[in-house]
């Protein structure tokens, strides 16, 4: 067309994909009558008639725009709906009278890409590679026009750098006309990049201006050789027997080498491999003193077969051995003396305490307990506690039973028992002494003896209440080689109408138990002699 070069620049109309473009014919009244206009689309310099306006009435031409065009603004504006990327072209309106004039409109189409999707190279990158390796791929789908990509490392944009950083971008056109951008970041990484955060940013334009979208941040597996291996012990601080202890190998390489943990045999001085769990952790549970010793870790790089050894680490599992008391089963005459000595070994300084088992009273702070002028009441349990003051909870104890030679000692001297004639009565009688006494009854019945502890015995008698029994009462006699002693049980008939037994009597209609733990007119005191034991 002659004079084309002098044509003014087309008017720019910007619109987003899917919306409606309003193409306003900019011919002035002097340039043409808008009631008689032809609209053309120009593609590759070829004009195609797409719409006619006659006497203000519009008519679409058959073709790709047939369904999407309509007239607005009293015929001055052509509306194009459902804009697609393919609609990015020049549209022109041509007035026929008084002379042929045209007005050009450049339609620019935009579409924001989807959120960029970043995928890190799952295989990782070795630090000693000769050329840049693929770090990550960024994909921005369905944008128009093609967005720009910028790569960032630790928040700073990456520039192309020969043999160091290379960004390789490509795009594909979807059937919709939209672009999908793929950008591959290749780089030579160093060990310090193991924690580096990479992300990509898509820059794009919309009618409203410039915009950008950022991907999530990713880190890439960076492989670098191990230079050092070391041991770590949990928990930190003083360890004691019974603790759960974990010994693990650590290395500064990625991937970590193949670990093995060994302990020095104190006899041979040889390192002996320990069995670790699936995670390569040596778990000592419960820790014992035998676990103490020198541990080291070996890291073997399976690629290079280079082996590294950690600094040895001394592990100390603090312990208190079994507590030994001597004499272990002391027997003494009344009036004599007794020295109890407590011994234990420990990895730390020990503190000893002697306690009276029955009362918990602290008798002595130290390993030796001296008891003078022993009375029968001094018999029973004494506990030695060996503890490590610097390690709470690390202690062991041993109970020793002191036996005082003597004739039987009755739990009660006399007791009243309320009974009913012809009932079967269950009577019990308790005695203590050293040697342990035996109990006999002065009436016939079924008796059974139960040893309560080394110095105490309980005898139970089942007997039928008869008038003779009511008359005589019941006696139990405890004897040992040093003498004998008797308890008397007085039987009283229950008067059902007036029965209000006092608190020191035992009542029963079918059975009645004279328990030594309820004392009537008692002239002796009872005591519990616990069993010896050793416990950690």
């Amino acid at each position: 067309v002659p004079g084309e070069a002098e044509q003014p620049a087309p008017e720019l109309v910007e619109v987003e994909v899917g919306s409606t473009a309003l193409l306003k014919c900019g011919l002035s009244q002097s340039q043409g009558n808008l009631s008689h206009v032809d609209w053309f689309s120009v593609h590759k310099e070829k004009r195609t008639l797409i719409f006619r306006v006659r006497q203000g009435q519009g008519q679409s031409e058959p073709g790709e725009y047939e369904q999407r065009l309509s007239l607005q603004d009293r015929g001055a504006t052509l509306a194009l709906t459902q804009v697609t990327p393919q609609d990015e072209r020049i549209f022109l309106c041509q007035g026929k009278r008084p002379r042929s004039q045209e007005y050009r409109i450049q339609l620019r189409v935009y579409k924001a890409p989807e959120e960029p999707n970043i995928q890190v190279n799952p295989l990782g990158i070795p630090v000693n590679s000769k050329e840049p390796e693929e770090v990550a791929t960024c994909v921005g789908r369905n944008g128009y026009p093609i967005p720009q990509v910028i790569w960032y490392k630790n928040g700073r944009p990456l520039k192309e750098e020969k043999n160091r950083v290379h960004i390789q971008s490509s795009q594909t056109v979807e059937s919709s006309g939209l672009y999908t951008l793929q950008s591959i970041l290749k780089a030579q990484l160093v060990k310090e990049d193991k924690d580096a955060q990479f992300y990509c940013e898509l820059n794009y334009r919309l009618p409203s201006g410039n915009h950008m979208k950022e991907s999530r941040e990713v880190t890439v597996p960076v492989f670098y050789p191990t230079e050092k291996v070391w041991l770590e012990v949990e928990p930190v601080g003083m360890l004691k027997e019974g603790d759960r202890v974990e010994i693990r190998c650590l290395a500064d390489g990625n991937p970590p080498p193949h670990f093995s943990i060994s302990k020095q045999n104190p006899s041979t001085r040889e390192a002996e491999e320990e069995t670790t769990n699936d995670n390569g952790v040596l778990v000592l549970e419960p820790a014992r003193k035998e676990h103490s010793g020198r541990y080291e870790c070996q890291g073997l790089d399976l690629d290079t077969m280079i082996s590294l050894l950690s600094e040895p680490q001394e592990l100390l599992v603090n312990y208190v051995s079994d507590v030994r008391v001597s004499p272990a089963a002391p027997e003494r005459q009344e009036g004599s003396s007794l020295t109890l000595t407590c011994e234990a070994e420990s990895s730390q300084d020990l503190e000893f305490q002697w306690l009276r088992e029955e009362t918990g009273q602290v008798l002595e702070r130290g390993p030796v307990l001296q008891l003078h002028d022993l009375k029968r009441e001094a018999g029973g349990g004494y506990r030695c506690v060996a503890s490590v003051p610097s390690i709470p909870g690390l202690n062991r104890t041993q109970l020793v039973n002191v036996a005082i030679f003597g004739p039987p000692w009755m739990a009660f001297k006399e007791r009243k028992v309320w009974v009913k004639e012809n009932m079967v009565l269950n009577l019990s009688c308790e005695a203590s002494g050293h040697p342990r006494p035996t109990i006999s009854w002065n009436v016939n019945g079924t008796a059974s003896e139960q040893d309560q502890d080394p110095q105490r015995v309980l005898s139970t008698l089942n007997v039928l209440v008869t008038p003779e029994l009511l008359e005589t009462g019941v006696e139990c006699t405890a004897s040992n080689d040093l003498g004998k002693n008797t308890s008397i049980l007085f039987l009283e008939l229950v008067n059902l109408t007036t029965l209000t037994p006092d608190s020191n009597t035992t009542t029963g209609l079918s059975t009645s138990t004279a328990s030594p733990h309820t004392r009537a007119n008692s002239t002796s005191t009872e005591r519990k002699l616990p069993e010896p034991e050793s416990r950690g």
């Epitope: 027997e331 502890d453 010896p532």
Partner: antibody, heavy 118, light 111 residues
Framework: QVQLVESGGGVVQPGRSLRLSCATS????????IHWVKQAPGKGLEWIAR????????YYNEKFKGKFTLSVDKSKNTAYLQMNSLRAEDTAVYYC???????????WGAGTMVTVSS | DIQMTQSPSSLSASVGDRVTITCRAS??????????MHWYQQKPGKAPKLLIY???NLESGVPSRFSGSGSGTDFTLTISSLQPEDFATYYC?????????FGQGTKLEIK
């Protein structure tokens, strides 16, 4: 130190009697029990009886009751085992041993051999 | 009567070996934590010698290589490392009730 010394053993004819002595020293005689234990040649140990010198109370193994009798002389700190109606099966070494009230034998005499033979 | 059964009746071992002798009672010989079981060593022509009393207590003067354990009816005498002077016959004895009885003995011989 604590010592127990048996004496009175020897060769005796069947049906005869013998009294074994156990002289003690080094401890308070009346505070401990004296036991007698039999060991036939090549055999194991058999408990015969015990006596508490403080009260003269005795207990016997039913197997030896009526045949053997225990006694003490507190003034001499000595215990005795009177053996009656001896038979060949009574041939053995007889030991006296001391115990406390838990009845384990912490001190033993060297034993005296009794041979019943015609 | 409570029967005491020792096993083995005899055994051969070498110096330095760890040896275990067991004794089983026909009923329990324990009372609330105290086990009335004792062990003795007897050498030919000598009187028995107390090693362990009340199941696990080492008699004064007895080497620590000897130890005892057990409760109820089953008991063990262990010699951790045999010494030449340990070759002898070993007896267990209960004192839970009358009459007191001994095991039949275990003869420990040099291999």
């Amino acid at each position: 130190q604590v010592q127990l010394v048996e004496s009175g053993g020897g060769v005796v004819q069947p049906g005869r009697s013998l009294r074994l002595s156990c002289a003690t020293s080094g401890y308070i005689f009346t505070n401990y029990w004296i036991h007698w234990v039999k060991q036939a040649p090549g055999k194991g140990l058999e408990w015969i009886a015990r006596i508490y010198p403080g009260t003269d109370i005795t207990y016997y193994n039913e197997k030896f009751k009526g045949k053997f009798t225990l006694s003490v002389d507190k003034s001499k700190n000595t215990a005795y085992l009177q053996m009656n109606s001896l038979r060949a099966e009574d041939t053995a070494v007889y030991y006296c041993a001391r115990s406390g009230g838990y009845w384990y034998f912490d001190v033993w005499g060297a034993g005296t051999m009794v041979t019943v033979s015609s | 009567d409570i029967q005491m059964t020792q096993s083995p009746s005899s055994l051969s071992a070498s110096v330095g070996d760890r040896v275990t002798i067991t004794c089983r009672a026909s009923k329990s010989v324990s009372i609330s934590g105290y086990s009335y079981m004792h062990w003795y060593q007897q050498k030919p022509g000598k009187a028995p010698k107390l090693l362990i009393y009340l199941a696990s207590n080492l008699e004064s003067g007895v080497p620590s290589r000897f130890s005892g354990s057990g409760s109820g009816t089953d008991f063990t005498l262990t010699i951790s490392s045999l010494q030449p002077e340990d070759f002898a016959t070993y007896y267990c004895q209960h004192s839970r009730e009358l009459p007191y009885t001994f095991g039949q003995g275990t003869k420990l011989e040099i291999k």
